[in-house]
């Protein structure tokens, strides 16, 4: 003979657990039905009647089989620096991600809590590490003749500044390069100003 199927609510055998998509109600001391995603428990079960489920209201959701008395509120609308990649429905929360040109500075369980604009490298600097969904751009000084530098920097008039010898880097910065991986004093070069006339050591352009 086939095993008898128990219909909810039912009292579980001592030491056994309720089946999939059922929960044990402490008050009724019965195994009762869970509500499906998109629904919540409107009336809890008793010894003689099963859980009564109802659909989630607008702007609320349940993602899992549940017996919560109220659906969860969807997150607030996406801000102007975000795009909605998943809408709020009865079965899922809204997910906001950062729009192009921005990255997630503060993430949450799903999506992003706070977006920030990606850094732009200034003249004389190029991209050392591009931005990702969760990290900002990192800039580094241009090497002489570095084509990447000119294409990644916003166009700004170049004010006169100082460069170092022997390898000039940027007219907007005064860089000197220590020896690689120093644990002792890095070597430095003296700085010279940019200009049409022969430079005098130790001055910068204003």
């Amino acid at each position: 003979l086939p095993a008898q199927v128990a219909f909810t609510p039912y009292a579980p055998e001592p030491g056994s657990t309720c089946r999939l998509r059922e929960y044990y109600d402490q008050t009724a001391q019965m195994c009762c039905s869970k509500c499906s995603p998109g629904q919540h428990a409107k009336v809890f079960c008793t010894k003689t009647s099963d859980t009564v489920c109802d659909s989630c209201e607008d702007s609320t959701y349940t993602q899992l089989w549940n017996w919560v008395p109220e659906c969860l509120s969807c997150g607030s609308r996406c801000s102007s620096d975000q795009v909605e990649t998943q809408a709020c429905t009865r079965e899922q929360n809204r997910i906001c991600t950062c729009r192009p040109g921005w990255y997630c500075a503060l993430s949450k369980q799903e999506g992003c809590r706070l977006c920030a604009p990606l850094r732009k490298c200034r003249p004389g600097f190029g991209v050392a590490r591009p931005g990702t969904e969760t990290s900002d751009v990192v800039c580094k000084p241009c090497a002489p003749g570095d084509a990447v530098c000119t294409s990644t920097s916003p166009t700004r008039s170049m004010a006169p500044g100082a460069v170092h010898l022997p390898q000039p880097v940027s007219t907007r910065s005064q860089h000197t390069q220590p020896t690689p991986e120093p644990s002792t004093a890095p070597s430095t070069s003296f700085l010279l100003p940019m200009g049409p006339s022969p430079p005098a050591e130790g001055s910068t352009g204003d």
């Epitope: 920030a116 200034r122 900002d136 800039c139 910065s173 005064q174 000197t176 204003d206």
Partner: antibody
Framework: QVQLQQSGPGLVKPSQTLSLTCAIS??????????WNWIRQSPSRGLEWLGR?????????DYTVSVKSRITINPDTSKNQFSLQLNSVTPEDTAVYYC???????????????WGQGTLVTVSS | DIQMTQSPSSLSASVGDRVTITCQAS??????LNWYQQKPGKAPKLLIY???NLETGVPSRFSGSGSGTDFTFTINSLQPEDFATYFC?????????FGQGTRLEIK
């Protein structure tokens, strides 16, 4: 959470060398996104940026011209710290010296977001 | 070097007041300007970056504006903890330079 802890003497004699160290926790001196600065503050000169060191595949140093002939800023990767050496000091170098982390070197959003506690250095005989 | 001129050098105000500090650069620095707050015996603290962006965790009563050579820093509805010295700082060109500071005192 990034923390910067400064150490070094508070009194230096004229013509001697001022030496300060800044120990980093919560970041790395060889991080490819931070720069490590020394800034000083005195009633007469206000806040004065002295220089920085940072790593982007290789090490870079930038110094302000007014002290460039006397200053060295060194990273120490083994101890995760960086140091300031200022040679041939005079009473004019008396100030509170701060180390500071700079985020965003060479880009927009370039600022000092973490500072050491400050060290008052007096140059006097 | 780029000179940063702050005004006024000091000002007195009361809790609840709205105060404005200006910073003028000796040449065009785009929006490459930050504002810091410093309390006695403490290091400066970043409030505003890139002229108008509020640092995370800084109250919204602080704001900044401006571009080019003229910049403004405003505190709406002063709170007791806001009495301090405020500095602007440019990073358009090396050397990085600061304004001389504005000391905000209780009236």
């Amino acid at each position: 959470q990034v923390q910067l802890q400064q150490s070094g003497p508070g009194l230096v004699k004229p013509s001697q060398t001022l030496s300060l160290t800044c120990a980093i926790s919560g970041d790395s001196v060889s991080s490819d996104s931070s720069a490590w600065n020394w800034i000083r503050q005195s009633p007469s000169r206000g806040l004065e940026w002295l220089g920085r060191t940072y790593y982007r595949s290789k090490w870079y140093n930038d110094y302000t011209v007014s002290v460039k002939s006397r200053i060295t800023i060194n990273p120490d990767t083994s101890k995760n710290q960086f140091s300031l050496q200022l040679n041939s000091v005079t009473p004019e170098d008396t100030a509170v010296y701060y180390c500071a982390r700079e985020d965003g070197v060479g880009g927009t959003k370039d600022y000092f977001d973490y500072w050491g506690q400050g060290t008052l250095v007096t140059v006097s005989s | 070097d780029i000179q940063m001129t702050q005004s006024p050098s000091s000002l007195s105000a009361s809790v609840g007041d709205r105060v404005t500090i200006t910073c003028q650069a000796s040449q065009d620095i785009s929006n490459y300007l930050n504002w810091y707050q410093q309390k006695p015996g403490k290091a400066p603290k970043l409030l505003i970056y890139d002229a108008s962006n509020l640092e995370t965790g800084v109250p919204s009563r602080f704001s900044g504006s401006g571009s080019g050579t003229d910049f403004t820093f405003t505190i709406n509805s002063l709170q007791p903890e806001d009495f301090a010295t405020y500095f602007c700082q440019q990073y358009d060109n090396l050397p990085i330079t600061f304004g001389q500071g504005t000391r905000l005192e209780i009236k």
